[in-house]
């Protein structure tokens, strides 16, 4: 069954800034994400942001920036203007809708033990212990190294010192080691099956275009299920609506968002895909 996770973090740099991260774990395509605070949707919550995978984002104060992080996760930055931080005790909820299959919602809040100086990681104590262990380990290695050097110096006193030859093999080995990973990366880039982690390229298109077209972010949160939009839609008189095969509507007199069978509506960093665009009425 699909699940929704929510994580709330206090920013380390700005104590009045919070970030809500939400993600959807499960199959299916996401048609809308709603972020609220003070309770879930349908139980007295106040909307903060609404994110559509194709048409962009909308947000309300105190939300500062809502954006897609991946195809199935979002983040919302909040600016707390008040002197006393109301966000610290607030519940944030995220609802992922997949129309008409269903919707899933989950809530979360800032961990009560969060240090304002930290970004509230889920397990801060083990992280500190790891740092301490690292420092102690490094100290131990240095002490051991010093002792070993002293031991070598003592041995040098009792031995004649032979002439040292420069070691070419060592430098060659080092060069080869340094170059090999780079070569591997290059090969991976040319191999379509290589498992390299390429960066996701989310857009932050928050507004609709002045001519009435909604902004189209480059991160559709679903793979297309239906056919590409028909390219032969007629243009009618100004002010009327044109039904496109995929269920979106263009205002007549404007160019439809597709000009040929080979052109797709949502180009992004993962390559072309067909239009699904099933989420709106104009």
């Amino acid at each position: 069954t699909p699940e929704v996770w929510v994580q709330v973090q206090m920013e380390a740099t700005e104590l009045s800034s919070f970030t809500v991260h939400c993600g959807f774990l499960g199959p299916g395509s996401i048609s809308l994400v709603t972020v609220s605070w003070g309770g879930p949707d349908g139980a007295g919550g106040t909307k903060l942001a609404v994110l559509h995978p194709e048409l962009g984002t909308r947000q309300w104060a105190p939300a500062r920036q809502a954006r897609w992080e991946t195809q199935s996760s979002i983040s919302l930055a909040l600016e707390d203007s008040g002197a006393s931080s109301p966000f610290a005790n607030t519940t944030f909820c995220c609802k992922f809708a997949s129309f008409p299959e269903g919707s899933w919602e989950s809530c979360g809040s800032l961990p009560p033990s969060s240090d304002p100086g930290l970004s509230a990681p889920p397990t801060p104590v083990p992280i500190l212990r790891a740092d301490l262990a690292g420092i102690l380990g490094l100290s131990g290695v240095l002490l051991f190294g010093c002792g070993y050097l002293l031991h070598l110096l003592r041995r040098q006193k009792h031995r004649p010192t032979p002439r040292l030859q420069p070691s070419h093999t060592n430098s060659q080995a080092l060069t080869a080691q340094a170059w090999a990973p780079s070569q591997a990366s290059q090969a991976a880039l040319h191999d379509p099956y290589a498992t390299i982690n390429t960066s996701f390229c989310p857009a932050t298109l928050d507004t609709a275009h002045p001519n009435g077209w909604a902004s189209l972010p480059t991160h559709a949160a679903h793979q297309p299920q239906g056919p590409a939009a028909s390219a032969s839609t007629p243009i009618l008189a100004r002010g009327s609506f044109v039904s496109v095969e995929n269920g979106l509507y263009t205002q007549a007199g404007e160019r439809p968002p597709h000009t040929g069978p080979g052109l797709t509506l949502f180009p992004d960093c993962r390559g072309p895909r067909a239009v699904e665009g099933r989420f709106g009425v104009r």
């Epitope: 349908g42 559509h52 962009g56 129309f99 009435g212 902004s215 009425v281 104009r282």
Partner: nanobody
Framework: EVQLVESGGGLVQPGGSLRLSCAAS????????MGWFRQAPGKGLEGVAH???????RYVESVKGRFTISQDHAKNSLYLQMNSLRAEDTAVYYC??????????????WGQGTMVTVSS
């Protein structure tokens, strides 16, 4: 819990009429739009009509002049009067409440749907 319950669907002959109703209950966000979507058998979802928060109705071209969307705020209900029905209007009709992106209404909540079959 937000609940949207559609009713009024059924079998009707071409040229006939039907009136769909949608009863909304439970707290909802101050959404921007309320409307109807439909899904014909084996086809994708299609927006039929919606009413913006400003009360202006909007229709898809294929239903203009035949369908009328209306609201009753007192009863917290939405209606779709469908006249001069055609075979291609056969679909499951969903009542939705949602948010506007430009002139689009993106569903945030919806009902279970009601089936409309136009056949002789």
């Amino acid at each position: 819990e937000v609940q949207l319950v559609e009713s009024g669907g059924g079998l009707v002959q071409p040229g006939g009429s039907l009136r769909l109703s949608c009863a909304a209950s439970g707290y909802t966000f101050s959404t921007d739009c309320m409307g109807w979507f439909r899904q014909a058998p084996g086809k994708g979802l299609e927006g039929v009509a919606h009413i913006d928060s400003d009360g202006i109705p909007r229709y898809v071209e294929s239903v203009k002049g035949r369908f009328t969307i209306s609201q009753d705020h007192a009863k917290n209900s939405l209606y779709l009067q469908m006249n001069s029905l055609r075979a291609e209007d056969t679909a499951v009709y969903y009542c939705v409440v949602g948010f506007k992106f430009g002139d689009y209404c993106a569903p945030n909540d919806w009902g279970q749907g009601t089936m409309v079959t136009v056949s002789s």
